[in-house]
């Protein structure tokens, strides 16, 4: 890991390579409420008219070092009679999120932030724009 | 920013409180290619049968400052001929993200990492699973 | 503070399925993988596979695709493992844990679950 | 997958003893390696994360060092309560993998 000295005056901010060395706090990445979480059901993968299944996507030198990755199951989406509907597609939705990888020429836990696109779920789209009546 | 003095030599890791004191280079966080961000179809919120509107949550104190959030349009899906359907229920896929939030009450560029839960878009789900045959 | 409290010793036929539970309190179920593990004297532990109860996504060792299901049901916070056609090389200890997805690391275990197959 | 050989299979101290243990892996797995105490009847205790890093709660008696292929754990003055099997994994990707163990006995 990388310890910082903790000093008790901060640092100058005004240097041009700041961005290149701040200090982060691993340490308090659970804080996300446990009514949010729990309001999340884990099912919508299988129920949706867009299924999708996860894969667990590791990387040890990555913070998080696991992320699970949508992929769709199909190329259209299941109708109601539980059959695939050729006239609707089921596409992916993707989200880019921020992940922090070691910099493994540098200090075992010295990091650089990098940004990646992952799957999130699926949805089911038309070929065609139409709203709600 | 705090800036950490550089060694030539990679501080102790033996220390049990090394999660709370990482060194992060931010620079490279607009390194993503134009390309990877444009293979991300913004249409799909209208196109979809469950579809989304997307408002954007700021956050000066914040590593990203801005995120894009989804809200489902309608609490059912909209079918073929444009009509909401009462079977089918529209549901925001929600996904955990890491943000950097700056700690105010130590140095200004001192961040400490949070997770926090987005809606990414919306898939249509029926009340039962089915599976396409 | 964190438990993982699994279900007690099993005696099962040649040929059956049984399922092992594996219940979580002290933390946010959802936010947490939970991870099985078998041990045998010969053998040693032997890493099965995981379930995230929050997205419901699961990877199996491929030793074991075919011996073993997790599930999960978030309102009761119990994690599940169904271990099919059973065989004497089934009978082990079976143990769950948590595994920090950020951090990357297996923090808490179960006590284990004994299952001995026998005719 | 990574195997993690651990030697040695037991130890035979008297309290007030150092005691080390070692586990080699067979490719590297950086820093991501994990001691366990297992005491009968007990669930496994997270000792040591990260090669070197010790868990919250843990006596400073316990240590660990490493990175790479080649890991220690060691017990600074054994006491009569650490008589239980100690084991190390790799959390480096999975399968994840374990060593064999080492049944620490006390005279």
């Known amino acids: 890991a990388v310890l910082i000295p903790q000093s008790s005056v901060c640092p100058n901010a005004e240097a041009n390579n700041f961005l290149q060395n701040v200090k982060v706090n691993l340490k308090v990445i659970n804080s996300l409420s446990s009514k949010a979480s729990s309001r999340r059901p884990s099912d919508y993968l299988n129920r949706s008219t867009s299924p999708w299944t996860l894969s667990r996507n590791e990387d040890p030198d990555r913070y998080p070092s696991v992320i699970w990755e949508a992929q769709c199951r199909h190329q259209r989406c299941v109708n109601a009679e539980g059959k695939l509907d050729h006239h609707m597609n089921s596409v992916l939705i993707q989200q880019e999120i921020l992940v922090l990888k070691r910099e493994p020429e540098k200090c075992p836990f010295t990091f650089r932030v990098e940004k990646m696109l992952v799957g999130v779920g699926c949805t089911c789209v038309s070929s065609i724009v139409r709203h709600a009546s | 920013a705090v800036l950490i003095p550089q060694s030539s030599v990679c501080p102790n890791a033996e220390a049990n409180n090394f999660l709370q004191n990482v060194k992060v280079n931010l620079k490279v966080i607009n390194s993503l290619s134009s390309k990877a961000s444009s293979r991300r179809p913004s249409d799909y919120l209208n196109r979809s049968t469950s579809p989304w509107t997307l408002s954007r949550n700021e956050d000066p104190d914040r590593y990203p400052s801005v995120i894009w959030e989804a809200q489902c349009r309608h609490q059912r899906c909209v079918n073929a001929e444009g009509k909401l359907d009462h079977h089918m229920n529209s549901v925001l896929i929600q996904q955990e993200i890491l943000v950097l939030k700056r700690e105010p009450e130590k140095c200004p560029f001192t961040f400490r990492v949070e997770k926090m839960l987005v809606g990414v878009g919306c898939t249509c789900v029926s009340s039962i699973v089915r599976h396409a045959s | 503070q964190v438990q993982l409290q699994q279900s007690g010793a099993e005696l099962v036929r040649p040929g059956a399925s049984v399922k092992l539970s594996c219940k979580a309190s002290?933390?946010?179920?959802?936010?947490?993988?939970i991870h099985w593990v078998k041990q045998t004297p010969v053998h040693g532990l032997a890493w099965i596979g995981v379930i995230h109860p929050g997205n419901g996504g699961t990877a199996y060792n491929q030793k074991f695709k075919d011996k073993a299901t997790l599930t999960a049901d978030k309102s009761s916070s119990t994690a599940y493992m169904e271990l099919s056609s059973l065989t004497s090389e089934d009978s082990a200890v079976y143990y769950c844990?948590?595994?920090?997805?950020?951090?990357?690391?297996?923090?808490?275990w179960g006590q284990g679950t004994t299952l001995t197959v026998s005719s | 997958s990574i195997v993690m050989t651990q030697t040695p299979k037991f130890l035979l101290v008297s309290a007030g003893d150092r005691v080390t243990i070692t586990c080699k892996a067979s490719?590297?797995?950086?820093?991501?390696v994990a001691w366990y105490q297992h005491k009968p009847g007990q669930s496994p205790k997270l000792l040591i994360n990260?090669?070197?890093n010790r868990y919250t709660g843990v006596p400073d008696r316990f240590t660990g060092s490493g990175y790479g292929t080649d890991f220690t754990f060691t017990i600074s003055t054994v006491q009569a309560e650490d008589l239980a099997i100690y084991f190390c994994?790799?959390?480096?990707?999975?399968?994840?993998?374990f060593g064999g163990g080492t049944k620490l006995e006390i005279k």
């Open positions: 990260y090669a070197s």
């Open positions: 002290g933390y946010t179920f959802s936010d947490y993988e």
């Open positions: 844990e948590r595994f920090l997805t950020y951090e990357g690391y297996f923090d808490y």
């Open positions: 490719q590297s797995v950086n820093n991501d």
């Open positions: 994994q790799q959390d480096y990707g999975s399968p994840y993998t």
